[in-house]
């Protein structure tokens, strides 16, 4: 891979109601199907058109699902994870990790062992500070006119 790719990592609780055709997405991952290097987590690989997840709009392809109805998805076989979703009932609560790429470079997911995912505040604090300095400088400039 060329260049460094950084990510904004955010977590969200998504509550889905099972539709007529189910929850409406596919998953990859598990201890026996590592989709991401050094990470046996469960990832969303496909959102089905007009399914419950698509209509809700918050779950995205590439999201990592951390838990289902409070049950951790760490260290599960792929089929056990699938079965957990299928048996999750009518109202399903998903704890999800979104990763947004914030720098040019190859698109890909980072494993849990990869340190280059950066927290959102690390980006927002400098941006906010820069904005405040620019605003102050602008006000000073206007006063001089």
């Amino acid at each position: 891979m060329n260049g460094r790719v950084d990510y904004l990592v955010t977590e969200e609780e998504i509550n889905l109601t099972r539709g007529p055709s189910g929850l409406g997405f596919n998953i990859v991952g598990g201890t026996d199907q590592q989709y991401v290097s050094n990470d046996s987590g469960i990832y969303v690989s496909r959102i089905k058109e007009n399914g419950a997840a698509a209509l809700d709009g918050r779950l995205q392809e590439g999201d990592k699902i951390l838990s289902v109805n409070g049950q951790d998805l760490k260290n599960l076989l792929h089929q056990d994870a699938v079965d957990l979703f299928r048996n999750a009932g009518y109202a399903v609560s998903l704890r999800v990790q979104h990763r947004l790429q914030v720098q040019n470079g190859p698109i890909g997911h980072r494993g849990e062992g990869d340190p280059s995912g950066i927290p959102i505040f690390m980006v927002l604090v400098p941006v906010f500070a820069l904005t405040m300095v620019a605003a102050w400088a602008f006000m000073r400039y206007r006063q001089q006119l």
Partner: nanobody, 129 residues
Framework: EVQLVESGGGLVQAGGSLRLSCADA??????????MGWFRQAPGKEREFVAH????????YYADSVKGRFTISRDNAKNTMYLQMNSLKPEDTAVYYC?????????????????????WGQGTQVTVS
């Protein structure tokens, strides 16, 4: 990007055998996460489900019309899925398509529904005389 390529079709006499292959020319390591299927379409007819296989080959499903005659399998190390067709009949004549979806559905399997699959090959012609 997924790029499915079928091969192995041809002209065969009734009672004969053919082995179709479906290779992903593009994917590399993600092939092992695909759920996959074979469909067929005879002239003037709708696309028909033939067989389905899950990501590691541990679960397979067949249309009633091919049960006991066709066998679906896969070799993830070779990025390839197969359809072994034995005891072929004239009514098996069709263009055969392989299809794939990335990952496993968290819903009940509807493996015979073409909408469950995102990627399709161009097809290979099978003619049984």
């Amino acid at each position: 990007e997924v790029q499915l390529v079928e091969s192995g079709g041809g002209l065969v006499q009734a009672g004969g055998s053919l082995r179709l292959s479906c290779a992903d020319a593009a994917s590399g390591r993600t092939f092992s996460t695909y759920t996959m299927g074979w469909f067929r379409q005879a002239p003037g007819k709708e696309r028909e489900f033939v067989a389905h296989i899950n990501w590691d080959g541990s679960n397979t499903y067949y249309a009633d019309s091919v049960k006991g005659r066709f066998t679906i399998s896969r070799d993830n190390a070779k990025n390839t899925m197969y359809l072994q067709m034995n005891s072929l009949k004239p009514e098996d004549t069709a263009v055969y398509y392989c299809a794939a979806a990335i990952g496993s559905t968290v819903d009940s399997y509807r493996h015979s529904d073409p909408l469950e699959y995102d990627y399709w090959g161009q097809g290979t012609q099978v003619t049984v005389s």
